[in-house]
């Protein structure tokens, strides 16, 4: 399945919005830094592009879930959040179309269930971290920076797979 060119643009817009959402400097939050164990190998590496699409879909769905909580709404600018949701929603639609198109075609017996679980655990670690830090401004800034990094890595791997094909 070929994702539309708008998908790449949407990924870039998503990253831009995440950058604009920054409220405080990450340097003032160095004591709150945390390794969440992002499973980046599950987004590229030896896979074919079609195999990583369900994993990328899970990633974007989890980002959507993370930023659509009550605690998130209190932490970020509402206008930017709304634009952010719109971008994520569009990307989910693009990926869902690909997943449906790929059903019965891919030869992945487990639909990358292990990769999907790794992504879910990654986001649960983030959620637990926010809870432990009582959703402080620094905790949210650490999470925003982490999501920027992991989202960028996952979409870059997708792009490199696309260019290989």
């Amino acid at each position: 399945c070929d994702l539309p060119q708008t998908h790449s643009l949407g990924s870039r817009r998503t990253l831009m919005l995440l950058a604009q959402m920054r409220r405080i400097s990450l340097f003032s939050c160095l004591k709150d830094r945390h390794d969440f164990g992002f499973p980046q190998e599950e987004f590229g590496n030896q896979f074919q592009k079609a195999e990583t699409i369900p994993v990328l879909h899970e990633m974007i769905q989890q980002i959507f879930n993370l930023f659509s909580t009550k605690d998130s709404s209190a932490a970020w600018d509402e206008t930017l959040l709304d634009k952010f949701y719109t971008e994520l929603y569009q990307q989910l639609n693009d990926l869902e179309a690909c997943v449906i198109q790929g059903v019965g075609v891919t030869e992945t017996p487990l639909m990358k269930e292990d990769s999907i679980l790794a992504v879910r655990k990654y986001f649960q670690r983030i959620t637990l971290y926010l809870k432990e830090k009582k959703y402080s401004p620094c905790a949210w800034e650490v999470v925003r920076a982490e999501i920027m990094r992991s989202f960028s890595l996952s979409t870059n791997l997708q792009e490199s797979l696309r260019s290989k094909e």
Epitope: E42, G44, Q46, V55, L110, K121
Partner: antibody, heavy 117, light 111 residues
């Protein structure tokens, strides 16, 4: 099926690599783990390599073991074995990863590693 | 580090009887259900009996039943057979995979 090889008698501090060979399936589609069992003792989860290549180790195994995979094998490298690492080492596959990375349903027969001076 | 405590460490059962093995985790397993049960006989690799706390693995007799959620789990073997003499292990999967672990094992002796 899966089968382990490479187990032997080594002296403490001598690195050793165990190999797991898969037959009848592609390693790129499955999560593969390593579990060990010291003589007369219980099972210990060492770590797992996911289909994409992400590796997770249990706390005590980090730094002591390295798991890697190629298209046909999964390797477990013991970086600097001690006498406490004497055990049978099992390689295992899970067909149920949605239920966690300990739900191994296909196991090799195991390979014995003895660390002694 | 997480601890999975299995009780009892050894249990004796008569053929046709029922055995219950408990597995208690010091912290909730992932998704409250990421717990597996294994059977191991001397000189053999472990065999998966139950995954997802209560789902029977392929080819496992329905005499084996897994139950529980979160931190407390039970494996029940009803209508015990001679062939059930083995050591049984639980294994827990956690949000942080560095904490994944097996229980200490329970030896089942069949009389």
């Amino acid at each position: 099926s899966v089968e382990e090889s490479g187990g032997r008698l080594v002296t403490p501090g001598t690195p050793l690599t165990l190999t797991c060979i898969a037959s009848g399936f592609s390693l790129s589609s499955y999560a593969m783990g390593w579990v060990r069992q010291a003589p007369g003792k219980g099972l210990e989860w060492i770590g797992i390599v996911l289909s994409g290549g992400t590796v997770y180790y249990t706390n005590w195994a980090k730094g002591r073991f390295t798991i890697s995979k190629t298209s046909s094998t999964v390797d477990l490298k013991m970086t600097s074995p001690t006498t406490e690492d004497t055990a049978t080492y099992f390689c295992a596959r899970t067909d149920y990863p949605a239920y966690g990375f300990t739900s191994f349903n296909i196991w090799g027969p195991g390979t014995l590693v003895t660390v002694s001076s | 580090a997480q601890v999975l405590t299995q009780t009892p460490s050894s249990v004796s059962a008569a053929v046709g009887g029922t055995v219950s093995i408990s597995c208690q985790s010091s912290k909730s397993v992932y998704n409250n259900n990421c717990l597996s049960w294994f059977q191991q006989k001397p000189g053999q690799p472990p065999k998966l009996l139950i995954y997802g706390a209560s789902t029977l693995a392929s080819g496992v007799p329905s005499r084996f039943k897994g139950s529980g959620s979160g931190t407390q789990f039970t494996l029940t073997i009803s209508d015990v057979q001679c062939d059930d003499a083995a050591t049984y292990y639980c294994a827990g999967d956690y949000v942080d995979d560095m904490e994944n672990t097996f229980g200490g094992g329970t030896e089942v002796v069949v009389k």
